[in-house]
Amino acid sequence: SWMWNQFFLLEEYTGSDYQYVGKLHSDQDRGDGSLKYILSGDGAGDLFIINENTGDIQATKRLDREEKPVYILRAQAINRRTGRPVEPESEFIIKIHDINDNEPIFTKEVYTATVPEMSDVGTFVVQVTATDADDPTYGNSAKVVYSILQGQPYFSVESETGIIKTALLNMDRENREQYQVVIQAKDMGGQMGGLSGTTTVNITLTDVNDNPPRFPQSTYQFKTPESSPPGTPIGRIKASDADVGENAEIEYSITDGEGLDMFDVITDQETQEGIITVKKLLDFEKKKVYTLKVEASNPYVEPRFLYLGPFKDSATVRIVVEDVDEPPVFSKLAYILQIREDAQINTTIGSVTAQDPDAARNPVKYSVDRHTDMDRIFNIDSGNGSIFTSKLLDRETLLWHNITVIATEINNPKQSSRVPLYIKVLDVNDNAPEFAEFYETFVCEKAKADQLIQTLHAVDKDDPYSGHQFSFSLAPEAASGSNFTIQDNKDNTAGILTRKNGYNRHEMSTYLLPVVISDNDYPVQSSTGTVTVRVCACDHHGNMQSCHAEALIHPTGLSTGA
């Protein structure tokens, strides 16, 4: 059997000879050189050589435990003559013994960390870690202790964990933001002769809201013309806050002053300024100066710093309204006037009024915008604003006239304003009713008396207030001895009825009936329309079969003896 124990070898051997490791030996070895010892495995033949006769093993190179702490090799004892193993191949271990040849190395050359300003003493900042490549299981070569070389009295380090904590109360970022801390890690438990390494920790104090906003001045003054429309910015105010980021965000608000309803303040998120804007229309003639109380406050407040005072500040803003030469102002936004369509030229319809709102009360002249009255139907008195007709009107042609009147300051023609005028033309009964269409009808030769052969409808261009009321009758000259009668239906229609039994188309092929249509308005208007009636041959159902077409083609010379 094999005779050896585990081999141990000290790392970093510096002797001039090969380093002796140990001896492989089989109890089958008679010492006569008949056995050959063979080494294989980790580093065999290179790092480790064996005397094949004696089994003595030597290390040929300086070994570093940190590179490889254990070598696993295999041993054979073979009969030189036959090649027969005298022992089974066996595995053995060479363990490299540690010396303290490695200093602790931090995982980072430079650490970066942050901690909130004003943190309590003992607040965790960051943990640094140093590793020592030496053997942690043997001696203190890898036992690391941390200490602070630079960064006191602001920070401290826990010797065993490498945890860095704050060590000073009320560290104020606004005073100092950056700290460079140097930490040492020393092995041998920090004892004399230990190896050490250092790292730098760059610590930045992060901001907390421990500063209120402050206006740099107590009063601001701005001017704005009275013509500024709502939303117009008239000035910017800015409070400063020593904090940063959201802790320095400021919200502005108007808390008091007689301009409370007239002005707004909005916060410019980019510049953190308060922009004073016009909220309602200003009027120099009504009020020339406004004062506002504007407040700047932090929207995000940390309760633990409220003892430092309120996180807001206020300033007075004085706004001077400047006078602007304003155009005349009409008494109404629009005027609606009425006039009868039979009005004579120069009839006054009504009037408009405009005044200069300025203190000067400049006189005003009036005119019609001719682009809105191309036919010059209306005119205006330039002095008093009276509107009158300059042409005859016809409601049936145009019911509404929409024109624009201009008021201009006499002393400053650039100042003008406009107002719409809506003129309604009122109806007068100046049109007679007439047939709604051309009527041409027929009667069967075998027609019976009082038979309806046609219904008549009328139209009238007028638009009477109480609606149309038409009456129908035969013209006086045709009334006596007529072959047909007109029956007024009293509903603005009338019927033509036969007056006898049977008609002979050979005797009379066509009848012309003059019908008088009258309206019921004042003054009464009437017209006469003619209805053509042809006599036709019909079937027993009363359906027309044939008529004298010539009656249509040659209407002249027809009898009017209807």
Epitope: G33, N79, R80, T82, G83, R84, E87, E89
Partner: antibody, heavy 117, light 111 residues
Framework: EVQLVQSGAEVKKPGSSVKVSCKAS????????MHWVRQRPGQGLEWMGD????????HYTQKFKDRVTITVDKSTSTAYMELSSLRSEDTAVYYC??????????WGQGTTVTVSS | DIQMTQSPSSLSASVGDRVTITCRAS??????????MHWYQQKPGKPPKLLIY???NLESGVPSRFSGSGSETDFTFTISSLQPEDIATYYC?????????FGGGTKVEIK
């Protein structure tokens, strides 16, 4: 370079002896066993015996035990094989071969021994 | 004595063919995982040349087309792709026990 150089061909009478030499070079002579192998015409290989040059320990096959003697001269790094009582069936090529862990890694060029009356 | 039976005694194959020779020992020639079987090549008029030792180890300088395998009593020698220069007689040999013995040889020829 390892070399094994054998003595020249021999013609012998039946009943006589022959001594074949094998001079080694290119390695430490005493570190390796030296073997002798013969090959009769048209036949296979036949191991005869071997010697440890450092201690002159020998091993012979039973067939040749009484007739063969293997010796060495360490000073000249030469091995010898003497075969006595020769018979016609001893006509063969005789090889020396270096032994290493049971295998023959280097061989001499061979010596032809002819036994004829 | 340990008898070594080698087969076939001769074979003829084409260039590029895979050639396999077997050697059977009359008893085991293996111990502690070591197989004391070796293979040689002998060309006419020349001494034998070691190709494979301890059953499967290729001797330095020998082409990789030669290989060996096996354990205990059964061993195989293979030429993966026969070349013209491989025409020779091949022998197995055991060193497990005295006397050391050789197989009868296998003569390899090209078709």
């Amino acid at each position: 370079e390892v070399q094994l150089v054998q003595s020249g061909a021999e013609v012998k009478k039946p009943g006589s002896s022959v001594k074949v030499s094998c001079k080694a070079s290119g390695y430490t002579f005493t570190n390796y066993w030296m073997h002798w192998v013969r090959q009769r015409p048209g036949q296979g290989l036949e191991w005869m015996g071997d010697i440890d040059p450092s201690h002159s320990e020998t091993h012979y096959t039973q067939k040749f035990k009484d007739r063969v003697t293997i010796t060495v001269d360490k000073s000249t790094s030469t091995a010898y094989m003497e075969l006595s009582s020769l018979r016609s069936e001893d006509t063969a090529v005789y090889y020396c071969a270096r032994g290493d862990l049971g295998r023959f890694d280097y061989w001499g060029q061979g010596t032809t021994v002819t036994v004829s009356s | 004595d340990i008898q070594m039976t080698q087969s076939p005694s001769s074979l003829s194959a084409s260039v590029g063919d895979r050639v396999t020779i077997t050697c059977r020992a009359s008893e085991s020639v293996s111990i502690h995982g070591t197989h004391l079987m070796h293979w040689y090549q002998q060309k006419p008029g020349k001494p034998p040349k070691l190709l494979i030792y301890a059953a499967s180890n290729l001797e330095s300088g020998v082409p990789s087309r030669f290989s060996g395998s096996g354990s205990e009593t059964d061993f195989t020698f293979t030429i993966s792709s026969l070349q013209p220069e491989d025409i020779a007689t091949y022998y197995c040999q055991q060193s497990f026990e005295d006397p050391w013995t050789f197989g009868g040889g296998t003569k390899v020829e090209i078709k």
